[in-house]
């Protein structure tokens, strides 16, 4: 099974405590990624004023970032475990190109950006083992991802800062919603 970052042998079977359940292990792993995102957001906010920008201005950006909706079966109303798990895995796979884009966007937090990217790959593997309906999971086309990456990297400085901020914010929101949903499984 994939090794979850932030987890050492004592987490799995510490003396005088119960071993972590699968749900708690996934939770711990997602929290590790969220901590990484927090650190990256700090650096982004410190070097630009993107974090103060209004939501309306941000919404004008034409990034097609994965977002959870009611139809995905991840909310308490209309919760559907199989549909939701497919949405979470598909969404994480779609975020991978954006996490690749982030790799050259940080100076002091370069290692943190790499850790977020690698941990997400491990999370995807971990969740794929849990999924019953793997055929329903659509993997983005490598050529589409490559051209998207080129397009993002060709933006001016202001747009690149805005894109970085939006990716981090959206990824945080997607993971937090995933956390809520995964706890119901």
């Amino acid at each position: 099974a994939p090794v979850l970052p932030g987890e050492d042998s004592k987490d799995v079977a510490a003396p005088h405590s119960q071993p972590l359940t699968s749900s708690e292990r996934i939770d711990k792993h997602i929290r590790y990624i969220l901590d990484g995102i927090s650190a990256l957001r700090k650096e982004t906010c410190n070097r630009s004023n993107m974090c103060e920008s209004s939501k309306e201005a941000l919404a004008e950006n034409n990034l097609n970032l994965p977002k959870m909706a009611e139809k995905d079966g991840c909310f308490q109303s209309g919760f559907n475990e199989d549909t939701c798990l497919v949405k979470i895995i598909t969404g994480l796979l779609e975020f991978e190109v954006y996490l690749e884009y982030l790799q050259n966007r940080f100076e002091s937090s370069e290692e943190q950006a790499r850790a977020v990217q690698m941990s997400t790959k491990v999370l995807i593997q971990f969740l794929q083992k849990k999924a019953k309906n793997l055929d329903a999971i659509t993997t983005p086309e490598p050529t589409t991802n490559a051209s998207l990456l080129t397009k993002l990297q060709a933006q001016n400085q202001w747009l690149q800062d805005m894109t970085t901020h939006l990716i981090l914010r959206s990824f945080k929101e997607f993971l937090q919603s995933s956390l809520r949903a995964l706890r119901q499984m």
Epitope: L20, E24, D27, K55, M68, F75, E173, S177, R183
Partner: antibody
Framework: EVQLVESGGGLVQPGGSLRLSCAAS????????MIWVRQAPGKGLEWVSD????????YYADSVKGRFTMSRDISKNTVYLQMNSLRAEDTAVYYC?????????????WGRGTLVTVSS | DIQMTQSPSTLSASVGDRVTITCRAS??????LAWYQQKPGKAPKVLIY???TLESGVPSRFSGSGSGTEFTLTISSLQPDDFATYYC????????FGQGTKLEIK
């Protein structure tokens, strides 16, 4: 000043409806995770519902599921609790509160509460 | 809903005593637990979050521990201001509370 102010409480007959409002100031509800908690007279705290700002995802306690609806109006920076088919056991002080934006979250801001009395 | 069972429901103690309140979750909740103090007629205030992190401004005599299903709140040396009701709350799924522990003067 960062605060939450509840309103809309009062006396209502069993089977009736009431809508509570919670006006937020000093922060925006559009990027915060909000919660309603109630406390029956002389009893403990009971979580009622919460609303995660992302896509407006709501969760409800089993005791109110299907009867209560939590919603928000971002333009008014206000959260609501629509309470239908009220019962005597819904009598309580209703607190509006904010979950801290962290993982795991905790309640870092409370309103002063509004009293709802369900009685004939 | 996740059930939170708090014990004892009432605790009689004296100033200077060390007291411990326990909270048990009906399923594993990792460290998604907070402790609150409530005084009559007032809204609760957070003491401990993430199971063991002390809220800023809260005296260091308060401490929290535990993970998974078993949690404790300890007050190392009771002060007159500490006589109140204490609640644990999980935020793993929803936000259910324990039934409360009333700490009273012996």
């Amino acid at each position: 000043e960062v605060q939450l102010v509840e309103s809309g409480g009062g006396l209502v007959q069993p089977g009736g409806s009431l809508r509570l409002s919670c006006a937020a100031s000093g922060f925006t509800i559009s990027s915060n995770y909000m919660i309603w908690v109630r406390q029956a007279p002389g009893k403990g705290l009971e979580w009622v519902s919460d609303l995660y700002y992302y896509a407006g995802d709501t969760y409800y306690a089993d005791s109110v599921k299907g009867r209560f609806t939590m919603s928000r109006d971002i333009s008014k920076n206000t959260v609501y609790l629509q309470m239908n088919s009220l019962r005597a056991e819904d009598t309580a002080v209703y607190y509006c509160a904010r979950w801290a934006d962290d993982h795991p979250p905790w309640i870092d801001l409370w309103g002063r509460g509004t009293l709802v009395t369900v009685s004939s | 809903d996740i059930q939170m069972t708090q014990s004892p429901s009432t605790l009689s103690a004296s100033v200077g005593d060390r007291v411990t309140i326990t909270c048990r979750a009906s399923q594993g909740i990792s460290s998604w637990l907070a402790w609150y103090q409530q005084k009559p007629g007032k809204a609760p205030k957070v003491l401990i979050y993430k199971a063991s992190t002390l809220e800023s401004g809260v005296p260091s005599r308060f401490s929290g521990s535990g993970s998974g299903t078993e949690f404790t709140l300890t007050i190392s040396s009771l002060q007159p201001d500490d006589f109140a009701t204490y609640y644990c709350q999980q935020s793993w799924l929803g936000g259910s509370f324990g039934q409360g522990t009333k700490l009273e003067i012996k």
